[in-house]
């Protein structure tokens, strides 16, 4: 799979964790830090 | 399926505002970005702004600043753009475009018709 | 706001012909870069993001390339069915369309 930074317009998409652009899927994908989860790591769990 | 689905046509007179909603289905706004895009007949296409729904947060294209104003319901997966101070030459095809968790997918367009 | 300068306008070829389109970014996009058909009355359709990525369903005559300010798409043999106007849009930073460019047979 092929993938990229995010583009600039997405500063901002994941609330805690780091944006990664799947360009084979068309897709902008969240790679959570611990303890966060959600599509765009919006959610802490313990 | 996901979709896209916009209100109906709306024929508005010069001076007045006008709301295009675009519902949600198949998926959950606050997981994208929602853009809106125009084309007024015969013409190109014209990028006026966008919404995060889950944070609330704006951009707009200058030309538009203070004539649109672009919201989301999250409550209702639903997000919209109004525009205000119409002119004939806001008569186009407004449409929205969910972005983020897939590249620019299209709701079906609505007519806005600025007469007199 | 990044201004997106397409060329040509419009253009007139004969089917098997090798058509190019270019769009000029007024600083650099990063590659971030989508082509788009629209035929008259429909939606656009997205044929090309990121440059030279193609779509699912999408034929392969399409291409796309370029990097920094400067790109290209080209239809390496037209067909009827290409018949449109194709549009650029760069998507770095917010969004901007190309002018668009209007695909004809000779």
């Known amino acids: 799979v092929s993938i990229t930074k995010c583009n600039s317009d997405m500063n901002g998409y994941c609330l805690h964790g780091q944006c990664i652009y799947l360009v084979d899927m068309s897709q902008n994908y969240c790679r959570c830090e611990v303890g966060y989860t959600g599509v765009r790591c919006e959610h802490f769990y313990l | 399926q996901d979709q896209l689905v916009q209100s109906g046509a709306e024929v508005k007179k010069p001076g007045a505002s006008v709301k295009v909603s675009c519902k949600a289905s198949?998926?959950?706004?606050?997981?994208?970005?929602i853009q809106w895009v125009r084309q007024a007949p015969g013409q190109g296409l014209e990028w006026m702004g966008r919404?995060?729904?889950?944070?609330?947060?704006?951009k707009y294209r200058e030309k538009f600043e203070g004539r649109v104003t672009i919201t989301a319901d999250t409550s209702t997966n639903t997000a919209y753009m109004e525009l205000s101070s119409l002119r004939s030459e806001d008569t186009a095809v407004y449409y929205c475009?969910?972005?983020?968790?897939?590249?620019?997918?299209w709701g079906q367009g609505t007519l806005v018709t600025v007469s007199s | 706001d990044i201004q997106m300068t397409q060329s040509p306008s419009s253009l007139s070829a004969s089917v098997g012909d090798r058509v190019t389109i270019t769009c000029k970014a007024s600083?650099?996009?990063?590659?971030?870069i989508a082509w788009y058909q629209q035929k008259p009355g429909q939606a656009p359709r997205l044929l090309i993001q990121?440059?030279?990525t193609l779509q699912p369903g999408v034929p392969s005559r399409f291409s796309g390339s370029g990097s920094g300010t400067d790109y290209t798409f080209t239809i390496s043999s037209l067909q009827p069915e290409d018949i449109a106007t194709y549009y650029c849009?760069?998507?770095?930073?917010?969004?901007?369309f190309g002018g668009g460019t209007k695909v004809e047979i000779k």
């Open positions: 475009v969910r972005s983020g968790t897939l590249f620019d997918f």
């Open positions: 198949g998926f959950n706004i606050k997981d994208t970005y």
């Open positions: 919404i995060d729904p889950l944070r609330g947060n704006t």
């Open positions: 600083q650099d996009i990063h590659k971030y």
């Open positions: 990121y440059t030279s």
């Open positions: 849009l760069q998507y770095d930073n917010r969004r901007t």
